[in-house]
């Protein structure tokens, strides 16, 4: 019987962003079936009109596939027939934000679901110790961020404290001219204290820690993306 | 059935502007873009251009950048392709046509003369 | 901007000749790669889309390969109403240029 005899399938995908010039991932899992030639896959994005990708009776289906996506989509089809439709985006551009939406029809029926991708760049701090500046220094680089961040510096020892009058941040644009460099200095800073730099947009949130002791420098950092959710 | 339906001839001066326009019917007006394409006499066809219906966002051929504007009309399910400062190299049929990565169905064209 | 060459640019044939035209593209294009055919004082009519997909209400006499730079039009039997002149276009990336035609006349 046709497509509009079947009942609906559970499609789920998942929120996420993606960093400019790398690969991303696009989440979508639904309910399997037990015959791949049965499952169709596709991926669409709104104001687009061609579509971001199709697979079909096995295999990539892209007559229709819209130009900002060429040779940038792939599905993962060895995982098709377990139920995963995750779209691997290649060299994510900032245009690729978006709403987009997962596809799905199997032999038990069709569904789809929707899915937020936000863009940008975002990277993992580096807190050293400025040696060449007159006084005890620490200055935080980041290569790589987009849309403009904003950097505090907190301190385990002074905790609340607020650091901006004896901060100094800049932004420099990368050769591409989108994504920036961030830099930021703290001045006078003590010994024997562990302080943070803290580099957050509306995409992600970066931390670089540093440890100054007499003996030794500690150095920890983490990145986290913001609002990613089911 | 789908039909494009285009605007009769226009004879311009040097200098002048043109404003052609497209109207669709018998599919979803803001499903698939739409392309301008020119061909002056006895010669090949040349890439002018699209529009997103949907968006209105447009792409133009490089040579035609700063001539060149498309516009859409989604209470009409029209597109108006303008160019200005027209060149006696301008004269050429000019069709519009459907698609997404081929065109299909075209206009009938509408011929611009441009001459003093 | 990606470059089509087509060839030849005109061909004389007689009702009932097999013949090709063909185009190769100044990159690789996949298979976004599309026919039109053009009778003078008419617009162009798609013949084939994504290089061998023949187009609903044409003729099966033509059929279109290849793949990657290099590709065909085949008509398999000349018929009459076939005599026209056939362009190729790439649709892989904007702008989405045109062969510079093939004008195909009777012998």
């Known amino acids: 019987f046709g497509i509009s005899g079947r009942h609906s399938i559970t499609v789920t995908t998942v929120a996420s962003a993606g960093n400019i010039g790398e690969d991303g991932i696009l989440s979508c899992t639904f309910e399997p079936d037990i015959k791949l030639s049965d499952i169709v896959i596709q991926w669409l994005k709104e104001g687009v009109l061609g579509l971001v990708h199709e697979f079909k009776e096995g295999k990539d289906e892209l007559s229709e596939q819209d130009e900002m996506f060429r040779g940038r989509t792939a599905v993962f089809a060895d995982q098709v027939i377990v139920g995963n439709a995750s779209l691997r985006l290649k060299n994510v551009q900032l245009t690729d934000a978006g709403t987009y939406k997962c596809y799905i029809i199997t032999s038990k029926g069709k569904g789809n679901a929707n899915l937020e991708y936000k863009t940008g760049a975002f990277s993992m701090p580096e807190v050293n110790v400025d040696y060449n500046a007159s006084s005890e220094t620490l200055r935080c680089e980041a290569p790589r961020w987009f849309p403009q961040p904003t950097v505090v510096w907190a301190s385990q020892v002074d905790q609340g404290a607020n650091f901006s009058e004896v901060s100094n941040t800049s932004f420099e644009l990368n050769s591409e001219n989108v994504t920036m460099k961030v830099v930021s200095v703290l001045y006078n800073v003590t010994i024997n204290n562990t302080y943070s730099c803290m580099i957050e947009n509306d995409i992600a949130k970066a931390t670089g820690d540093i440890k100054v002791t007499e003996s030794e420098i500690k150095r920890r950092s983490h990145l986290q993306l913001l609002n990613s959710k089911a | 059935q789908v039909q494009l339906v285009q605007s009769g001839a226009e004879v311009k001066k040097p200098g002048a502007s043109v404003k052609v326009s497209c109207k669709a019917s018998?599919?979803?007006?803001?499903?698939?873009?739409m392309y301008w394409v020119r061909q002056a006499p006895g010669q090949g066809l040349e890439w002018m251009g699209r529009i997103n219906p949907t968006s209105g966002n447009t792409v133009y051929a490089q040579k035609l950048q700063g001539r060149v504007t498309m516009t859409r009309d989604t209470s009409t399910s029209t597109v108006y392709m303008e160019l200005s400062s027209l060149r006696s190299e301008d004269t050429a049929v000019y069709y519009c046509a459907r698609g997404i990565n081929w065109f299909d169905p075209w206009g009938q064209g509408t011929l611009v003369t441009v001459s003093s | 901007d990606i470059q089509m060459t087509q060839s030849p640019s005109s061909l004389s044939a007689s009702v009932g000749d097999r013949v090709t035209i063909t185009c190769q593209a100044s990159q690789d294009i996949s298979n976004y790669i599309n026919w039109y055919q053009q009778k003078p004082g008419k617009a162009p009519k798609l013949l084939i889309y994504a290089a061998s997909r023949l187009q609903s209400g044409v003729p099966s006499r033509f059929s279109g390969s290849g793949s990657g730079t290099d590709f065909t039009l085949t008509i398999s039997s000349l018929q009459p109403e076939d005599f026209a002149t056939y362009y190729c276009?790439?649709?892989?990336?904007?702008?989405?240029?045109f062969g510079q035609g093939t004008k195909l006349e009777i012998k």
């Open positions: 018998g599919y979803t007006f803001t499903a698939q873009y």
């Open positions: 276009q790439q649709s892989y990336r904007s702008p989405f240029t």
